[in-house]
Interface confidence: low
Amino acid sequence: LIIGFGISGRHSITVTTVASAGNIGEDGILSCTFEPDIKLSDIVIQWLKEGVLGLVHEFKEGKDELSEQDEMFRGRTAVFADQVIVGNASLRLKNVQLTDAGTYKCYIITSKGKGNANLEYKTGAFSMPEVNVDYNASSETLRCEAPRWFPQPTVVWASQVDQGANFSEVSNTSFELNSENVTMKVVSVLYNVTINNTYSCMIENDIAKATGDIKVTESEIKRRSHLQLLNSKAS
């Protein structure tokens, strides 16, 4: 790819990306920022992917230029056009696929100079778990469910009262393939739970870590859940 802009003698500019993860089937964002320019017409943004011949996305002279876009990204990319002038070159990627994983380059040219930065983009599936009391069971049982995970995660139970306890002998985890034959539903059951305790169901793969907590007392049940993407780092 040859870019015919007279850029000799220009300074390099700072471009910053943040490694991130995409949830397959949903929209994702590849984050990239740069030193802003005064004129939108002087800014060129190119997104490239390692191993892909065509461009992922190009934005120049204030609009998208998609004549050299690779087929695998056709109709799935957009920049935040209203934010380019303030230095935001982030790319929105529609309907994230497993094959979108890889190394991307955010390449910027402005009147001040040029610069680029790489980012690692992981793809998989991750979702918030919900923990509920299973009233259908014969003994006090908790059921932790999360609808979409890939690759297959590990599931670990923990308890506030019995910190450090190993619950593998009193729990059972199953993975059920979803209809698209990639992601899986995670179901984990914990038996012999006690009242006045807080239990945590922790689901983790190499992309995300999620925790579903349930606090069971005689008078009420409280729940919370939290999802954290792993290995996000700026470059």
Partner: antibody, heavy 119, light 108 residues
Framework: QVQLQQWGAGLLKPSETLSLTCAVY????????WTWIRQPPGKGLEWIGE???????NYNPSLKSRVTISADTSKNQFSLRLSSVTAADTAVYYC?????????????WGQGTLVTVSS | EIVLTQFPGTLSLSPGERATLSCRAS???????LAWYQQKPGQAPRVLIY???RRATGIPDRFSGSGSGTDFTLTISRLEPEDFAVYYC?????????FGGGTKVEIK
């Protein structure tokens, strides 16, 4: 009514260690994340880190190597230590309570402590 | 980390007008973990909205929040004199917890 009251040194020299403490009056120390947030003069808010009643801490990666947050649950207090300060650490430092059971928001804040780092 | 970009940076309006403040996340945030705060000079921030759209205790109904995924909005239906302040969005769907850069709502 929950109140957070904070104190600590307001003037430091570069390379010194910032130390602030926040006391929690009213309400339980459990079920919450006890947090430190800072705001440089005229700028936005930056999360420093948090601790819960069982001592689990989470820190902002940008400050992790210099930050220690600890708690004394018997006194309903938690503290912040930030080592090797520079002028860039000059800010108003707030302690705050994050409710993780209900709304994942900071409902209660300390009054703020202006910490100035100057030689 | 999730970067929250707020725009506009400054909003110049008159009392009685409608204010629309935007917060865009660099990746999807569960609405459970998106909050809005108001801060006046010399004061600590005050929570207005949590869970993207639920008003905190004691917050007037002229404040409303909406949005999901990467785009969130705080709307003040009719600005009162006491509403002129700086507004921040905040997320904790992913660690580290992050705040937006803020939008200043000033009197025109």
């Amino acid at each position: 009514q929950v109140q957070l009251q904070q104190w600590g040194a307001g003037l430091l020299k570069p390379s010194e260690t910032l130390s602030l403490t926040c006391a929690v009056y009213g309400g339980s120390f459990s079920d919450y994340f006890w947090t430190w947030i800072r705001q440089p003069p005229g700028k936005g808010l930056e999360w420093i880190g948090e601790i819960n009643h069982s001592g689990t801490t989470n820190y902002n990666p940008s400050l992790k190597s210099r930050v220690t947050i600890s708690a004394d649950t018997s006194k309903n207090q938690f503290s912040l230590r930030l080592s090797s300060v520079t002028a860039a650490d000059t800010a108003v430092y707030y302690c705050a309570r994050l409710s993780s059971w209900s709304n994942w928001a900071f409902e209660y804040w300390g009054q703020g402590t202006l910490v100035t780092v100057s030689s | 980390e999730i970067v929250l970009t707020q725009f506009p940076g400054t909003l110049s309006l008159s009392p009685g007008e409608r204010a629309t403040l935007s917060c865009r996340a660099s990746q999807s945030v569960s609405s459970t973990y998106l909050a809005w705060y108001q801060q006046k000079p010399g004061q600590a921030p005050r929570v207005l909205i949590y869970g993207a759209s639920r008003r905190a205790t004691g917050i007037p109904d002229r404040f409303s929040g909406s949005g999901s995924g990467t785009d969130f909005t705080l709307t003040i239906s009719r600005l009162e004199p006491e509403d002129f302040a700086v507004y921040y969005c905040q997320q904790y769907g992913s660690s580290p917890l992050t705040f937006g850069g803020g939008t200043k709502v000033e009197i025109k």
